[in-house]
Amino acid sequence: TCEIVTLDRDSSQPRRTIARQTARCACRKGQIAGTTRARPACVDARIIKTKQWCDMLPCLEGEECKTLPDNSGWTCTQPGGRIKTTTVS
């Protein structure tokens, strides 16, 4: 499970109005860090192990996911045709 945590604003810069956000995720046994719906998530470790990236549903609703030919990551294709590529280090 993941929750989005809003960090305190930088008090040394009063004009700064945007707080930083980060995810805190507590994964269950058999899960490790991944991406679901373009956000940090805990996913089945076997998905990562086998590089079946699209099985963790990394793209936003309505986008099409495809694993890169060399299994190094995935692409998310928006309905308008714009493609976002993510590679896993």
């Epitope: 980060t22 995810a23 805190r24 995720c25 507590a26 994964c27 269950r28 046994k29 058999g30 899960q31 490790i32 860090a33 940090p40 805990c42 470790a45 076997r46 192990k49």
Partner: antibody, heavy 129, light 104 residues
Framework: AVTLDESGGGLQTPGGALSLVCKAS????????MFWVRQTPGKGLEYVAE????????NYGSAVKGRATISRDNGQSTVRLQLNNLRAEDTGTYFC??????????????????????WGHGTEVIVSS | ALTQPSSVSANPGETVKITCSGG???YGWFQQKSPGSALVTVI????ERPSDIPSRFSGALSGSTNTLTITGVQADDEAVYFC???????????FGAGTTLTVL
């Protein structure tokens, strides 16, 4: 190089308590789940306890549940096992082990016994009166 | 409990296969030359091999059974091999009873 160095073993009395410490080096300690595994005479390997990378989760084997406490200090790169109400069957060699998966920042991750990639040399515990 | 054979034997240069079944998540294989002595991981996460382990050691997962293969076994490989994984409910670690490899 990854090194795990256990200490705290030795002769213990039945009903007493022991505290084992594992000092880690050579890797980002706070990113890895850690285990204690023991080998008792005439038996194979036995899962004793484990702790998540950030210390928020702990789990224990049935033989020590209710008597054991695992904890970690990520600042000192140590993991500790406290075992109370010692019994003769607790006699054996206790190993500290690391789970290979490097948990990224913001995540709390369990280790996996099948992902143990490094072991300490072990510390021998003898429970006898 | 995990199921693995209690013993296997082979001549130098032969291929040895040791199976382990009955667990969940991933499997590892741990070598021990004598009881109470140091444990060495030869395979972790089903098929990953530590950099200092010879390439003759390999692991493969099929369903819920993992197989450790030693291709071209050597006298130095004589040891007890324990498999390890999570129990079927995924709530705790579990180890096999160990397989004694004898090189004839």
């Amino acid at each position: 190089a990854v090194t795990l160095d256990e200490s705290g073993g030795g002769l213990q009395t039945p009903g007493g308590a022991l505290s084992l410490v594992c000092k880690a080096s050579g890797f980002t300690f706070s990113s890895h789940g850690m285990f204690w595994v023991r080998q008792t005479p005439g038996k194979g390997l036995e899962y004793v306890a484990e702790i998540t990378n950030d210390g928020s989760g702990t789990n224990y084997g049935s033989a020590v549940k209710g008597r054991a406490t695992i904890s970690r200090d990520n600042g000192q790169s140590t993991v500790r096992l406290q075992l109370n109400n010692l019994r003769a069957e607790d006699t054996g060699t206790y190993f500290c082990a690391r789970s290979t998966y490097e948990c990224p920042g913001g995540f709390s991750c369990w280790g996996d016994t099948g992902q143990i990639d490094a072991w300490g040399h072990g510390t021998e515990v003898i429970v006898s009166s | 409990a995990l199921t693995q054979p209690s013993s296997v034997s082979a001549n130098p240069g032969e291929t040895v296969k040791i199976t382990c079944s009955g667990g969940s998540y991933s499997y590892g294989w741990f070598q021990q030359k004598s009881p109470g002595s140091a444990l060495v991981t030869v395979i972790y996460w089903d098929d990953e091999r530590p950099s200092d382990i010879p390439s003759r050691f390999s692991g493969a997962l099929s369903g819920s059974t993992n197989t450790l293969t030693i291709t071209g076994v050597q006298a130095d490989d004589e040891a007890v091999y324990f498999c390890g994984t999570e129990d079927i409910s995924g709530t705790a670690g579990v180890f096999g009873a160990g397989t004694t490899l004898t090189v004839l």
